[in-house]
């Protein structure tokens, strides 16, 4: 029990449990389809322990297998709107370093206004994850509708 208490007092990152849960800050200017994220206790239910934000993009600090998850809800959206706007897609990938650039998730909204997905994937220190939303609808900034996070699972 004493060990468990001591363990609870250690910072998560010292245990290798890098984790981040982010909320949407803003979209980029035109020709920049990236979503820009923010996180921290002052913002409510978002946090970063280990990974960090670099100009709104999530950068990994520890090698390992991560669970990456994301949910995006389109603002002012109905099923009719969503089907009309079928080009709207969300992609999550490693955008830097360029040598490791790869798409990890690609999702289309089709008939719905919300997409949510997750996957396990190896990530390395220095990897920056970008989330690109293309189409002609804006994402909701409500924290229970649009969020993005990673969780270190194992080396």
């Amino acid at each position: 029990q004493r060990f468990a208490q001591a363990q609870q007092q250690l910072p998560l990152e010292s245990l290798g449990w890098d984790v981040a849960e982010l909320q949407l800050n803003h979209t980029g200017p035109q020709q920049d389809p990236r979503l820009y994220w923010q996180g921290g206790p002052a913002l409510g239910r978002s946090f970063l322990h280990g990974p960090e934000l670099d100009k709104g993009q999530l950068r990994i600090h520890r090698d390992g297998i991560y669970m990456v998850h994301i949910q995006v809800t389109l603002a002012i959206c109905s099923s009719t709107t969503a089907s009309r706007h079928h080009p709207t897609t969300l992609a999550v990938g490693i955008c830097s370093p360029a040598s490791r650039s790869i798409s990890l998730l690609r999702l289309s909204f089709h008939q719905g206004c919300t997409i949510a997905s997750q996957r396990l994937t190896p990530l390395a220190r220095g990897d920056t994850l970008c989330t690109n939303l293309t189409g002609t609808l804006l994402p909701s900034r409500n924290t229970d509708e649009t969020f993005f996070g990673v969780q270190w699972v194992r080396p």
Epitope: A75, I76, T80, H85, P87, G135, T136, P139, S140
Partner: antibody
Amino acid sequence: QVQLVQSGAEVKKPGASVKVSCKASGYTFTSYYMHWVRQAPGQGLEWMGIFNPSDGSTSYAQKFQGRVTMTRDTSTSTVYMELSSLRSEDTAVYYCARDVGETTFDPWGQGTLVTVSS
Amino acid sequence: DIQMTQSPSSLSASVGDRVTITCQASQDISNYLNWYQQKPGKAPKLLIYDASSLESGVPSRFSGSGSGTDFTLTISSLQPEDFATYYCQQTNSFPITFGQGTRLEIK
């Protein structure tokens, strides 16, 4: 009926800012995106950006990024478009237009002529 | 950006004529194309959306067709009130772009 009523004509000096208003009526203000489009004298239509009145989020055309700001006052169902660092080539009629849910603009405001001249 | 090219840029026609205006997109935009009519000193008015759907209240002499990159607006029998400038608009992706306009004049 659905109506968008814009503020009156403005004359500004180069380097100044202008703030154009667009008052919506006849529908639920927060349920539709609003766009801003401008038209220089004798020229075509140029899209400036999209605004979400429900949460204030925006997406601006690259050309105007850093100079344009779109805001709203939900109590009066009014959207504002502010353009800063004005230059003579910003002389144009500025229109607000409601997005009817298909990135289709209907109706449009009557337009606001902004003249930039020293 | 997706470039929209309209032709012709101006056109003279007579009442009763059949007129066709074309709009070409620089890349595939599916059917994400609208047509607007603008009269001098007035705001544009929506005529056709989704390339071929007629907006409510617009006379049936207006029709639209096309998909992919090539689109047309046809006025089957010109009326005096149809003399105006017509714009196509792509709504496939941001930034939204318009054609340069086609000015329809009385011959």
